[in-house]
């Protein structure tokens, strides 16, 4: 080993070196939280970049760069260090127009803490392992969601566009002429029935057990879907999103009420099956796999 390499190894294995790097990262994080940093922080920023560069150089000199089994770039944690340094120099010396987007990558410096604190390294390792083990469960989840999304698509396509329409029009107005001119919120409120405080027109349906319109209004299929057009079963992707919402139970009762009002109470069965399978079974299966992965990592 050359004298330079010997020195680099001595520095690398010294506990004070690890302490220095840890303190640098933590101080750097504190500086990053500043709202309006004073001008002198620019010099501090250069100091941090210098320390990170020194750390990487020591590691490269001690272990080698990339040729060989235990070299610098063979350790995934060092990839993070490398990216941090590359972006530090990029944002400083290269004029790349929208630098604010690149500055976002400075936040990666906080992640360096993981590679320095051993306990944290273990937990993150377990997390990565659990993600690997989750692949099968994720495939099953996506498959189940896709199947139910297709069923939802067939059952409820277009249903959430059913609205209660006013039974009085101007002489020259017809349903189609109104459909072609509906744009603003006032237009919608002029022709459709809204419950007090509601941002969407009252939904209705054409089957006997679906929601009926009040006196003076008729059910028609016009305009956009509820919630600014984001709630629907009109395409596979929207249906998939709706099913994901049911699985995660994200304000699912509103989707349930909207769909049942537009399609009919019979379709409650669909929601019962989805909630039992998707929400109770699949979610707990995911949690079980994560728990198992942590258990394995601890052993």
């Amino acid at each position: 080993f050359s004298p330079l390499r010997r020195i680099s190894i001595k520095i690398l294995v010294h506990s004070l070196f690890s302490m220095l790097i840890m303190c640098t990262i933590l101080t750097n994080c504190i500086f990053m939280t500043m709202n309006n940093p004073p001008d002198w922080t620019k010099n501090v920023e250069y100091t941090f970049t210098g320390i990170y560069t020194f750390e990487s150089l020591v590691k490269i000199l001690a272990r080698g760069f990339c040729v060989g089994e235990f070299t610098f770039l063979r350790d995934p944690w060092n990839w993070l260090d490398f990216v941090v340094i590359v972006f530090a120099y990029l944002t400083e010396f290269v004029n790349l127009g929208n630098v604010s987007a690149l500055r976002t990558f400075r936040v990666l410096r906080a992640l360096k803490t993981i590679s320095v604190i051993p306990g944290l390294k273990t937990i993150v390792g377990a997390l990565i392992q659990s993600v690997k083990k989750l692949s099968d469960v994720m495939i099953l989840t996506v498959f189940c969601l896709s199947v139910f999304a297709l069923i939802g698509l067939q059952l409820f396509m277009g249903n959430l566009k059913h609205k209660c329409f006013r039974n009085s029009l101007e002489n020259n107005e017809t349903l189609e002429s109104i459909m072609n001119t509906l744009e603003s919120e006032e237009d919608f409120r002029k022709y459709f029935y809204y419950l007090e405080g509601s941002k969407d027109a009252l939904l209705c349906g054409f089957s006997t057990d679906s929601g009926q319109c009040p006196e003076g209004y008729t059910c028609v299929k016009i305009g956009r879907n509820p919630d600014y057009g984001y709630t629907s079963f009109d395409t596979f992707s929207w249906a998939f999103l709706a099913l994901f919402r049911l699985m995660t139970q994200d304000y699912w009762e509103n989707l349930y009420q909207q769909t049942l009002r537009a399609a009919g109470k019979t379709y409650m069965i669909f929601f019962v099956v989805v909630i039992f399978l998707g929400s109770f079974y699949l979610i707990n299966l995911i949690l079980a796999v994560v728990a198992m992965a942590y258990e394995e990592q601890n052993q």
């Epitope: 277009g158 349903l175 028609v220």
Partner: nanobody, 124 residues
Framework: EVQLVESGGGVVQPGGSLRLSCATT?????????TGWYRRVPGKERELVAR???????NYADFAKGRFTISRDNAKKTVYLQMNSLRPEDTALYYC?????????????????WGQGTLVTVSS
Amino acid sequence: EVQLVESGGGVVQPGGSLRLSCATTSRAFIRDVFTGWYRRVPGKERELVARIYNGGNTNYADFAKGRFTISRDNAKKTVYLQMNSLRPEDTALYYCLFSGTINTGREYRSGDYWGQGTLVTVSS
């Protein structure tokens, strides 16, 4: 194919009467906002004659008030236009319009569905 069946047109003398019928007997017709009668006089735009809403309320064009009566028979899914005191200027092609929702078999669709038209000629 969604079709409105119109009937009752023909030749009548001034001052005479005619009763037009518009049947929406096809199972495709689910629910209307209104069903109405429109007419087109050669060289002019199609204009509203009368219409009857789902709830039973009616609209008439100024020229039809007092002379024409629109009514509906929900059991037969038919709308009628009773035309009295007919004048030569009432000569036109009368169209039935179902403005509402139909079932295509795959989905519900709302819009305007026109009949083929029935010719009314008022002349002595």
